[in-house]
Interface confidence: low
């Protein structure tokens, strides 16, 4: 199923014609130099592929819409009723270049297609590549693919969120969390239970891929030596090894902490202790107060010693409904003594306090290195009863279909030019003939991209 057996758009036969440049004529010095005009031609794989689809025939043929329902959701939102269409990008600069578009917002979408033949993880690498354009930006949603495990139960018209997959790969975003997933499901050789293993997050800032409304090319390369690379627009953004760079790790640790071990009561974790030989100096007065009255202070002139600070409000009247039995004896509310307003103060004058120069506080011996320090206690290690060692995690469960099972709060996510292959050269050719044209048409081609494309065409006329 390469998707190019009908309605092929044969606009030109050769990339020398596709990139139409007037090489001989000198540009008019009064006019700005024009961009090369790019004409679209549907890409064709240059070798054997497990799957390829450019959607340029304009139909969903070969793709199966899911009729499943999510089993853990209310009925009205459980159905996979999100719409898919094959159409050109809204702002397309390449007439005839169609893609698969997720049309609806706030709905579950699921669509899948069978591979030409199952991919068996053996001696050849796996390369998965496709394009995504968030035409309306993206608020919260995914654009990742699932490579669906080859099982007797696999039924594509019942494809749903619990359908077993071997690999999940691609962009995903919610809020300000921008992700590029690479997850594979590893089978525990001891228990037979599958566990998701997630690649470490890329160091690169992924935000622009989601926000710039350009078409980006996502590539996953998985090698039989367990190494992997993730590329965006043909540049590596993440790489590693299935044995060392997945979370949780593929292989559990050989040893674990003894669950029964406990810290001995006399285990000493104190790095420092009070010096047992230190002696409190004879002149250390622990009872001296921190503050003392300032003996040099004098009472301000005009201080009214006999006037209280507060007096009963002379205008206050006992409320008519005051009940002495229930409310007690009525007392007029207090107000600031009006006589004190013009004086420096009223009432009994007290000396202000100052820091006591002789205050030393409670004596503490100085700290010294603890001669009995045993370090931070850790439980002893014991052999992990659940230990196993799988040194070839690349040998994953074979997969026989590709699926998109997505929820998005933003519509019009454009997918294009899916390819699954074991040959990097074929995938690179496909990228040049598809994404490369988009890039050139966008006028975003770096210097030399057009030249590279012409060279590529000359290599395989």
């Amino acid at each position: 199923h390469d998707g190019h057996d009908d309605d092929v758009i044969d606009i030109e036969d050769d990339l020398d014609d596709v990139i139409e440049e007037v090489e001989d004529s000198k540009p008019d010095t009064t006019a700005p130099p024009s961009s090369p005009k790019v004409t679209y031609k549907a890409p064709v794989p240059t070798g054997e592929v497990y799957f390829a689809d450019s959607f340029d025939r304009g139909t969903l043929s070969g793709w199966i819409l899911s009729k499943a329902k999510k089993d853990d959701t209310d009925d009205e939102i459980a159905k996979y009723d999100g719409k898919w269409e094959v159409e050109e990008m809204k702002e397309s600069k390449l007439p005839g270049d169609k893609g698969l578009v997720l049309m609806s917002r706030a709905k579950h979408h699921a669509i899948s297609a069978k591979l030409n033949k199952p991919f068996l993880f053996d001696t050849k690498p796996l390369i998965v590549q496709y394009e995504v354009n968030f035409q309306n930006g993206i608020e919260c949603g995914g654009a990742y693919v699932k490579l669906l495990s080859k099982t007797p139960e696999l039924n594509l018209d019942q494809f749903h969120d619990k359908t077993p997959y071997t690999i999940m790969f691609g962009p995903d975003k919610c809020g300000e969390d921008y992700k590029l997933h690479f997850i594979f499901r590893h089978k525990n050789p001891k228990t037979g239970i599958y566990e998701e293993k997630h690649a470490k997050r890329p160091d690169a800032d992924l935000k622009t891929y989601f926000t710039d409304k350009k078409t980006h090319l996502y590539t996953l390369i998985l090698n039989p030596d367990n190494s992997f690379e993730i590329l965006v627009d043909q540049s590596v953004v993440n790489s590693g090894n299935l044995l060392n760079d997945m979370t949780p790790p593929v292989n559990p640790s050989r040893e674990i902490e003894d669950p029964e071990d406990r810290k001995p009561e006399d285990w000493d974790e104190r790095p420092k202790i009070p010096d047992p030989e230190a002696v409190k100096p004879d002149d250390w007065d622990e009872d001296a107060p921190a503050k003392i009255p300032d003996e040099e202070a004098t009472k301000p002139e005009g201080w009214l010693d006999d006037e209280p600070e507060y007096v009963p409000d002379p205008d206050a009247e006992k409320p008519e409904d005051w009940d002495e039995d229930m409310d007690g004896e009525w007392e007029a509310p207090q107000i600031a003594n009006p006589r004190c307003e013009s004086a420096p103060g009223c009432g009994v004058w007290q000396r202000p306090v100052i820091d006591n120069p002789n205050y030393k506080g409670k004596w503490k011996p100085p700290m010294i290195d603890n001669p009995s320090y045993q370090g931070i206690w850790k439980p002893r290690k014991i052999p992990n009863p659940d230990f196993f060692e799988d040194l070839e995690p690349f040998r994953m469960t074979p997969f026989s279909a590709i699926g998109l099972e997505l929820w998005s709060m933003t519509s019009d996510i454009f997918f294009d030019n899916f390819i699954i292959c074991a040959d990097r050269r074929i995938v690179d050719d496909w990228a040049n003939d598809g994404w490369g044209l988009k890039k050139a048409a966008d006028g975003a081609a770096e210097p030399g991209v057009v030249g590279q494309m012409i060279e590529a065409a000359e290599e395989r006329p």
């Epitope: 674990i256 902490e257 029964e260 071990d261 406990r262 439980p379 002893r380």
Partner: antibody, heavy 116, light 112 residues
């Protein structure tokens, strides 16, 4: 006084469930690994399960794996044993014992009888 | 699993006489740190087990000094220097070095 008191035993039909508890007092419960050990009538002692002081690690005897679950609530100083899919051969007195490899403190035991 | 084998399984003794129980393990009980986790328990009739000896030879507090433990590697012994009436019951050895923890079958001590 350091003490462990088990409860929750009783008579139950095969295939049914039962939950045992073990209340600890007189020591810092949250510092100790805790075990369940059982003794079938007239037989010897059989280790059943262990849980680490903070509950993060648990191990089980093969004879109960997948059916029994050990857990603890350190805020309540209590150890639990959830026993599902009970069989006649699970009939025994169940003891909880304080850890540290040496099983230095034991409860008085609670009898579980599995019978139709 | 480590198998713990006790002998004899029944031990009739005369009051005041010594008694000896053997316990053999199918693997060495010396752990990587050089410690040997072999414990002895006493279970009197109708009672819970009670620890007597830990780490081969260390007596628990409150345990009479007529009880002693010895041995190394895979061979261990519990000795009662002079048996008293209160010593009647079943004695178990238990290894705490390997998972799962395993007990011996028990030795029943009774008065002749």
């Amino acid at each position: 006084e350091v003490q462990l008191v088990e409860s929750g035993g009783g008579v139950v039909q095969p295939g049914r469930s039962l939950r045992l508890s073990c209340a600890a007092s007189g020591f810092t419960f949250s510092s100790y690994g805790m075990h369940w050990v059982r003794q079938a009538p007239g037989k010897g002692l059989e280790w059943v399960a262990v849980i680490s002081y903070d509950g993060s690690n648990k191990y089980y005897a093969d004879s109960v794996k997948g059916r029994f679950t050990i857990s603890r609530d350190n805020s309540k100083n209590t150890l639990y044993l959830q026993m599902n899919s009970l069989r006649a051969e699970d009939t025994a007195v169940y003891y909880c014992a304080r850890g540290g490899r040496a099983f230095d403190i034991w409860g008085q035991g609670t009898m579980v009888t599995v019978s139709s | 699993d480590v198998v713990m084998t006790q002998s004899p399984l029944s031990l009739p003794v005369t009051l005041g006489q010594p008694a000896s129980i053997s316990c053999k393990s199918s693997q060495s009980l010396v752990n990587s740190g050089g410690d040997t986790f072999l414990n002895w328990f006493q279970q009197r009739p109708g009672q819970s087990p009670r620890r007597l000896i830990y780490k081969v030879s260390n007596r628990d507090s409150g345990v009479p000094d007529r009880f002693s433990g010895s041995g190394s590697g895979t061979d261990f012994t519990l000795e009662i220097s002079r048996v008293e009436a209160e010593d009647v019951g079943v004695y178990y050895c238990m290894q705490g070095t390997h998972w799962p923890r395993t007990f011996g079958q028990g030795t029943k001590v009774e008065i002749k």
